[in-house]
């Protein structure tokens, strides 16, 4: 890489006009950052102590009740995905603060901003297993008797994020330094080498298999199990689906910016007025995904809060509520009271 | 009107040092860098560096560790010094500076200074 | 580093012909501002380079609009509608979106 020393705040943000006025000194630009940036900045800030904070608690509340509590394995991956992620945020916030500006080198360039992306395939991927977990729980609560284990579950969380990793990579493989001339300027971004092609198909991809695909599923799963849950007006707690699904809706509500940015710049020939407008959003879109990082143990205490009437007890014991959370299935009135009974010993709540 | 003017020696002993002075007009090195490019029959036109208005300099990671580029703005001097030549140093050195701004490098260029690397 | 691959390397034309030299990068030249910073020059014999169009279409002060320059990501062309006398020389183009600024081999426009 070529050498250039950006302490200088000089060359900032300059923007290239055709307007020529050989009195104005060019190296001398604004210094301040656009409200997009400012906006992300602040997200980012509160994603990262919200995030790194309450997911550290939820791991360590989980941790310990994983070995017997299916519950807690499911909530315990999410938050360790959610944990990875928020360690990105200094560095991109950094280079934020430094207008884009990206002194950590190639490989730092591949894998933290990859992060969010592994991120959203784990997530995704484990949600969609969480309710998968929900959706036998309730239509099959016999083969979850018998089969439904610890076991199964880590290996379920083990295919999860194997997918994960794979879907990662064709960002981390694209993710490129480029070291612009004027002003002096180091970037990390995507670099397809013009193949507009390839950067659909990894769009589209990304769009489909993290967004549509799942949303339209979920949908589905979800309606089927309210479906079920208020037609047998189950009287015991449904503390853990409520949290779920609002996990989930929270999912598709932070990514959509993203998703809808990333295809349209995908479409878009880079310098277009659109592109250019999209591309000045682009923090702001994964910042507002970034709030995924943070959203789930506000979504957590705000369902313990619920459930206890008011917060009485501590925050760990309060999230240990709803996290680990032993349930009752009553789905068939055929069922006998010894076998309720016994399946309350067993299997989760809905 | 601006005009770049070179002075500088024309032949180099290997393993020596080259020093190249470029004095500008019409506009001020406080406000616009200088860039040095080299051409030679074997290489073409090559990049070497660039020292900025505010002083900063960015240099090709090829001639890195030999090159130096600094500048006296009250005199509108900018200086070239590459250490170590070799024979393949051999080449026309030219300053160019920009037209309005470095998005447009390169606009005007020096009159060149013939450089021959040769014991 | 971004190559630039100029073409042809040589170009013989009439007086009043029209020309036209390609030049190809291996990398997009689109800046993370939206411009592309794509420029032509051509040298004469003896002389240093001087600037013809830069931001690939925009022609440099004086330059007659016989000379005109198109293109997007990493093809472009220089073209002289009507070739005359004073354009022959060496024509080069040149990047300076990335570092470091990187130059074609050239392409000389003679008489045929």
């Known amino acids: 890489m070529d050498s250039f020393n950006y302490t200088t705040p000089d060359y900032g943000h300059y923007d290239d006009k055709d307007t020529l006025d050989l009195n104005t000194p060019v190296d001398k630009t604004s210094n301040t950052l656009r409200v997009p940036d400012i906006l992300a900045l602040v997200i980012f800030a509160v994603v990262f102590l919200v995030g790194v904070l309450g997911n550290a608690l939820v791991v360590w509340v989980t941790a310990f009740e994983a070995k017997r509590t299916i519950n807690a394995i499911w909530f315990l991956n999410l938050a360790v995905a959610d944990f990875l992620s928020c360690l990105a945020l200094p560095i991109l916030f950094t280079s934020i603060v430094q207008h884009h500006h990206w002194p950590f080198g190639g490989a730092a360039c591949s894998i933290l901003p990859s992060l969010i992306l592994l991120n959203m395939y784990a997530s995704i991927l484990l949600l969609a297993t969480i309710s998968a977990d929900r959706f036998l729980l309730v239509f099959k609560p016999i083969w979850c008797q018998n089969f439904r284990g610890a076991g199964l579950a880590w290996i379920a969380c083990a295919v999860a994020w194997g997918l994960a990793l794979l879907l990662t990579i064709p960002s981390f493989l694209y993710r490129v330094v480029r070291e612009e001339y004027f002003p002096p300027k180091v970037l990390c971004g995507v670099d397809y080498s013009h193949d507009k092609r390839r950067e659909r198909a990894v769009a589209i991809v990304r769009l489909v298999l993290g967004f549509l695909w799942p949303l339209l599923t979920l949908t589905i799963c979800y309606t089927f199990i309210l479906l079920r849950t208020w037609s047998r007006r189950a009287t015991r707690s449904t503390k853990t689906l409520k949290v779920v699904v609002a996990v989930v809706a929270s999912f598709f509500i932070f990514w959509l910016p993203y998703q809808v940015t990333g295809i349209m710049m995908s479409f878009l020939e880079p310098s277009s007025p659109t592109f250019l407008l999209l591309k000045k959003l682009d923090s702001l879109c994964v910042s507002f995904a970034y709030i995924n990082c943070c959203i789930n143990p506000i979504i957590y205490v705000v369902a313990g809060q619920g459930f206890q009437g008011r917060l009485r007890k501590s925050l760990p014991s309060l999230l240990r509520n709803v996290l680990t959370e032993e349930s009752v299935v009553r789905e068939s009135k055929s069922f006998t009271r010894s076998t309720v009974d016994t399946m309350a010993q067993k299997t989760q709540a809905v | 009107q601006v005009q770049l003017k070179q002075s500088g020696p024309g032949l180099v002993a290997p393993s020596q040092s080259l020093s190249i002075t470029c004095t500008v007009s019409?506009?001020?090195?406080?406000?616009?860098?200088v860039d040095w490019i080299r051409q030679s029959p074997g290489k073409g036109l090559e990049w070497l560096g660039v020292i900025w208005g505010v002083g900063g300099t960015n240099y090709n990671s090829a001639l890195k560790s030999r090159l130096s580029i600094s500048k006296d703005n009250s005199r509108s001097q900018v200086f070239l010094k590459l250490n170590s030549l070799q024979t393949d140093d051999t080449a026309m050195y030219y300053c160019a500076s920009p037209y309005y701004s470095h998005y447009v490098p390169f606009a005007y260029w020096g009159q060149g200074t013939l450089v021959t690397v040769s014991a | 580093d971004v190559v630039m691959t100029q073409t042809p390397l040589s170009l013989p034309v009439s007086l009043g012909d029209q020309a036209s030299i390609s030049c190809r990068s291996s990398q997009s030249l689109v800046h993370s501002n939206g411009n592309t910073y794509l420029h032509w020059y051509l040298q004469k014999p003896g002389q240093s380079p001087k600037l013809l169009i830069y931001k690939v279409s925009n022609r440099f002060s004086g330059l007659p609009d016989r000379f005109s320059g198109s293109g997007s990501g990493t093809d472009f062309t220089l073209k002289i509608s009507r070739v005359e006398a004073e354009d022959l020389g060496v024509y080069f183009c040149?990047?300076?979106?990335?570092?470091?600024?990187?130059f074609g081999g050239g392409t000389k426009l003679e008489i045929k």
């Open positions: 040149s990047q300076s979106t990335l570092v470091p600024p990187t």
């Open positions: 019409g506009f001020s090195l406080t406000s616009y860098g």
